[in-house]
Amino acid sequence: ELCDDDPPEIPHATFKAMAYKEGTMLNCECKRGFRRIKSGSLYMLCTGNSSHSSWDNQCQCTSSATRNTTKQVTPQPEEQKERKTTEMQSPMQPVDQASLPGHCREPPPWENEATERIYHFVVGQMVYYQCVQGYRALHRGPAESVCKMTHGKTRWTQPQLICTGEMETSQFPGEEKPQASPEGRPESETSCLVTTTDFQIQTEMAATMETSIFTTEYQ
């Protein structure tokens, strides 16, 4: 079942999912100047069985200047450079959490996708928190949140994490280097926008992995 609400917001912290449970939706969103093709998929869906899960449907974007066409527009070098600024290196995760039964890896990017990924989580999904750059974590317990079903309603558990304003950065499990963090957003924002990192889980041969920072909405 889909989770009604967003994962809790922790001051000066971001969260991410290491893997996505079956039933998770990722909206097919396109960057400015592009739109989802008219008969294109509305969303990608993590689907499968206990032994193998994958993302169903493909997102396709077309230039909004080109009406009712499925023409794929290749980003200009300038646009590619702009996208590249959100990527950086980070150490490999110690556990390939996407190999968990009933879970999907981070879906690969599609051409001209929006810089903001909009996921819709399902019951049982876990997200992990870390303090943004310039803040240090004070743990009172697990820095994670799980969407649970209680009395027919969904709710997220409260992560036990406080981020204090010291120039050290707490990392996700197994990470050693600090990651760049996005600009702080206005506190008045009521749209449930959250910043999270998207992980391309690598094979054991890979020494590093690319991590893109997305502003992601979960409503």
Epitope: L2, M25, R35, S41, L42, D56, H120, C192, E217, Q219
Partner: antibody
């Protein structure tokens, strides 16, 4: 919680136009496609079209091209559907609906009568 | 346009029964099918997305299944509050189209 609040019932004359509103709350209005659906007894549900407020992009069911015009005001998180050259065939309940994950407004009853 | 056919306009049932509402698409729509419940004077309420996944708050007695052209909404252990009209919808191809509806009635 996602909510779509539609404007009240309308009684209008044939040949005129009407504009129905749908105010969204509980989510980021600009990030989701919002559709409009017509329901008439004996005719079931018909998809009129949809709009992406973030870019003003629209899709229309061919059947409703020239009849319906979809717009959105991002400053007030409100979507609008204007129906023109009204006839008795346009008498129906009209729903706005966030396309996915689906969430529907309460409906607006339109009666076209002289 | 893709035609969604719900062959049974009415279905009679009793509390505690198991009932299956069927829907057939005129062409392959994959699993891009949703099911809605509508009670008199109310707007449709989304029950199922992607043919088989439940929306939050939807009791687990509602189960969706199928892919391609044939889809089923099964209600096990029918409750009195389940008496309503049920619609399928495809969103695989534009324009999105709905089935004609199946009204669940008490025997």
């Amino acid at each position: 919680q996602v909510q779509l609040q539609q404007s009240g019932a309308e009684l209008v004359r044939p040949g005129t136009s009407v504009k129905i509103s749908c105010k969204a709350s509980g989510y980021t209005f600009t990030n989701y496609w919002l559709g409009w659906v017509k329901q008439r007894p004996g005719h079931g549900l018909e998809w009129i079209g949809d709009i992406y407020p973030g870019g003003g992009y629209t899709n229309y069911n061919e059947k409703f091209k020239g009849k319906a015009t979809l717009t959105a005001d991002t400053s007030s998180s409100t979507a609008y559907m204007q129906l023109s050259s009204l006839t008795s065939e346009d008498s129906a309940v009209y729903f706005c609906a966030r396309v996915t994950p689906a969430s529907w407004g309460q409906g607006t009853s339109l009666t076209v009568s002289s | 346009d893709i035609v969604m056919t719900q062959s049974q306009k009415f279905m009679s049932t009793s509390v505690g029964d198991r009932v299956s509402v069927t829907c057939k698409a005129s062409q392959n729509v994959g699993t891009n099918v949703a099911w809605y419940q509508q009670k008199p004077g109310q707007s449709p309420k989304a029950l199922i997305y992607s043919a088989s996944y439940r929306y939050s708050g939807v009791p687990d007695r509602f189960t969706g299944s199928g892919s391609g052209t044939d889809f089923t909404l099964t209600i096990s252990n029918v409750q009195s509050e389940d008496l309503a009209e049920y619609f399928c919808q495809q969103y695989n191809s534009y324009p999105y189209t709905f089935g004609g509806g199946t009204k669940l009635e008490m025997k």
